[in-house]
Interface confidence: low
């Protein structure tokens, strides 16, 4: 199976309805606390606003957010785990009217309710300590 | 391994237009998704336009409508198609080969040296 090359950066244009799909691996054992990361930029640069920041720190807990105006806003904790050491996953993010809708394997584990307008979001950025087997964005 | 020769680059008065072509070296051309990216004195690189291994194609916004990227897989050519050209347009345009359809300079594995493009007003 071949793999995407991390950090990958792909241009989107989303809206009520739409699913991000994500299929990774962590790189490392949850002992060496691998990271995962993906960020909905509001432009084609890293340093710009992040309409939904999601990041796994794997064995321990997620964080979500926003960051405006290069302001990073009141973070958002869950400590489900769903996750396993050493194992592949299916990350996939649904674009509902009110919030983000994250599940895991099939099922929903993450809500974060909008703070920037979904429309506005034109780069996905998926990366940090993982392997990448599959990015898809579907309207 | 992929090298890439930019050439085209010049010097171009404000409403004039440029094309800027990319030739790259190896069989797996075809493979990568490719950019332009541009880089004026004093300033961070700045991601111009990127086209996917298919021909997909995105453009910073700056350049939206004046600017087209293509590519010719048979040939190992990307070209970037620059009308309406402003003073503001003024750096040096390199080319890029990744993995990734990215707008992001660190995902890209090679960098052409890149070729300088000044317009006056």
């Known amino acids: 199976m071949s793999l995407l090359s991390v950090p990958h950066t792909e241009s989107v244009s989303l809206s009520t309805g739409s699913t991000v799909t994500i299929e990774a691996r962590p790189l490392v054992c949850f002992f060496n606390e691998p990271h995962l990361q993906v960020d909905f930029h509001t432009e084609m640069k890293e340093d710009s606003d992040i309409a939904f920041h999601f990041q796994v720190y794997f064995g321990n807990r997620v964080v979500m957010n926003s960051r405006e105006y290069r302001t990073w806003k009141e973070e958002v904790e869950s400590k489900n785990m769903p996750f396993q050491d050493g194992q592949e996953f299916e990350l996939r993010i649904l674009v509902l009217e009110d919030k983000y809708q994250v599940m895991v394997n099939g099922q929903a584990y993450y809500n974060f309710n909008h703070r920037i307008p979904v429309s506005s979001v034109k780069m996905v950025q998926v990366w940090r300590d993982i392997s990448l087997t599959k990015f898809n964005v579907s309207n | 391994q992929v090298q890439l020769v930019e050439s085209g680059g010049g010097l171009v008065q404000a409403g004039g237009s440029l094309r800027l072509s990319c030739a790259a070296s190896?069989?797996?051309?075809?493979?990568?998704?490719m950019a332009w990216f541009r880089q004026a004195p004093g300033k961070e690189r700045e991601f111009v336009a990127a086209?996917?291994?298919?021909?997909?194609?995105t453009y910073a916004d700056s350049v939206k409508g004046r600017f087209t990227i293509s590519r010719d897989n048979a040939k190992n050519t990307v070209t970037l198609q620059m009308n309406s050209l402003k003073p503001e347009d003024t750096a040096a345009y390199h080319c890029?080969?990744?993995?990734?359809?990215?707008?992001?300079?660190?995902?890209?594995?090679?960098w052409g040296q890149g070729t300088q493009v000044t317009v006056s007003s």
């Open positions: 086209i996917t291994r298919s021909g997909g194609n």
């Open positions: 190896g069989r797996t051309f075809s493979t990568y998704s």
């Open positions: 890029a080969a990744g993995g990734t359809y990215s707008f992001v300079p660190r995902s890209y594995n090679y």
